[in-house]
Interface confidence: low
């Protein structure tokens, strides 16, 4: 405003240095030289007016604004808080669920164990009442016919490869043994094969067990006539040796499995186990 | 002179675990089947396992099946008696026994001098 007071004072000076040289000044400028700087005073006390107004217009909002943010900030505190904690929440029961159900699912699989069990269970019963009744009904074909033809094994015998065998529990010399097998229209057992001598090893453990192998009548014989040369053998080493050092009389004229399965000749009075064999008969 | 040395007895809690080792000597060992046999505190003596020569057969009594396992090491002479889940009723002094001959699985002629097993709480 100064400044503006300056420049009237300055153009007043100026006109009169022209009125000195020039003569009087036109009236009409000078009023519109007057009415101009008016104007533009009146503009800017305009202006600083729309300022102040605008600037406390700002303020206001600004301090509107402010309390909406602090608002909106405290909301958004509370919401990540609720929010967290209802995570937590959920959290908690999917882990009381996943907990639920995994004793559900054990549960399930318990039950399913068991009756796979009794599926199995009652599958072995089944089996075993029907191979009973087959048994019971070949034992009466059996009884009926005499005993000729036999197409099943007798109670208490076990089969395998076509031959019905029967382990001993008790103690006899060979010739007992053998007539015992006999009554039972079978033989001492007969040794045909590896395979034959695995399955009689598994079924009588590590115990002196009479075959039904003997030279008493000079070379080594089978009871059922098989050759003895050309079938299977399975001797201890250096067996048979018809030891004499018993001190039991005479040599070792009949073969037993020896505690390992392989065979060894012996005094024939020894008491021993034994086995009986008989062929199944080819209709079955 | 045959020898037989049982070694690995002590005191071990039930549920526990001990492996006893027998060590041979005098004989051909692998000539012979082996067997392990107990005496508890103030009874008979007990036939416990067996296993053949070449140890590919052996033979359990019903008591320890499935509980005890035989074995031998015929490079080093020595039988051995893995005995796992044992009871108090295993209790006894172990012996370790050479087969009298090949032909009688039941009879013995020569007997360590045992080894004290005792299963306790």
């Known amino acids: 405003m100064t400044k503006d007071y300056q420049d009237f004072q300055h153009l007043d000076n100026d006109n009169d240095h022209h009125q000195l040289r020039r003569g009087p000044p036109p009236t009409p400028r000078l009023l519109q030289r007057l009415c101009s700087g008016s104007r533009l005073l009146l503009l800017s006390s305009s202006l600083s007016i729309l300022l102040l107004v605008v600037v406390c217009v700002i303020t206001s909002q600004n301090s509107q604004l402010r309390e909406d943010l602090l608002a909106l900030r405290q909301n958004f505190s509370n919401l990540t808080v609720s929010t967290e904690d209802q995570v937590k929440a959920l959290s908690t029961q999917g882990s009381s669920v996943g907990r639920k159900m995994k004793l559900v699912e054990s549960k399930l699989e318990k039950q399913q164990k068991d009756l796979t069990e009794d599926h199995s269970s009652l599958l072995l019963h089944v089996k075993q009442l029907v191979s009973d009744v087959r048994s019971l009904s070949c034992q009466m074909a059996a009884f009926r016919g005499n005993g000729s033809e036999r197409t099943c094994c007798p109670i208490n015998w076990v089969e395998y490869e076509g031959s019905c065998y029967w382990f001993s529990s008790s103690v006899r010399p060979w010739t007992e043994a053998d007539k015992y097998c006999q009554l039972e229209n079978a033989h001492l057992v007969v040794v045909t094969s590896r395979d034959e001598q695995n399955f009689l090893q598994r079924h009588m453990g590590p115990l002196n067990t009479w075959i039904g192998l003997t030279d008493q009548n000079g070379p080594w014989k089978w009871v059922d006539g098989t050759d003895y040369e050309t079938g299977f053998q399975n001797w201890r080493p250096e067996q048979p040796d018809n030891w004499y050092g018993h001190g039991l009389g005479g040599g070792e004229d009949c073969a037993h499995f020896t505690t390992d399965g392989r065979w060894n000749d012996d005094v024939c009075r020894r008491p021993y186990r034994w086995v009986c064999e008989t062929k199944l008969d080819k209709a079955n | 002179e045959v020898q037989l040395l049982e070694s690995g007895g002590g005191l071990v809690q039930p549920g526990g675990s001990l492996r006893l080792s027998c060590a041979a000597s005098g004989f051909t060992f692998d000539g012979y089947d082996m067997a392990w046999v107990r005496q508890a505190p103030g009874k008979g003596l007990e036939w416990v396992s067996w296993i053949s020569g070449d140890g590919l057969n052996t033979y359990y009594a019903d008591s320890v099946k499935g509980r005890f396992t035989i074995s031998r090491d015929n490079s080093k002479n020595t039988l051995y008696l893995q005995m796992n889940s044992l009871r108090a009723e295993d209790t006894a002094v172990y012996y370790c026994?050479?087969?009298?001959?090949?032909?009688?699985?039941?009879?013995?002629?020569?007997w360590g001098q045992g080894t004290l097993v005792t299963v306790s709480s």
């Open positions: 026994a050479k087969q009298y001959d090949y032909e009688s699985a039941w009879r013995f002629d020569y």
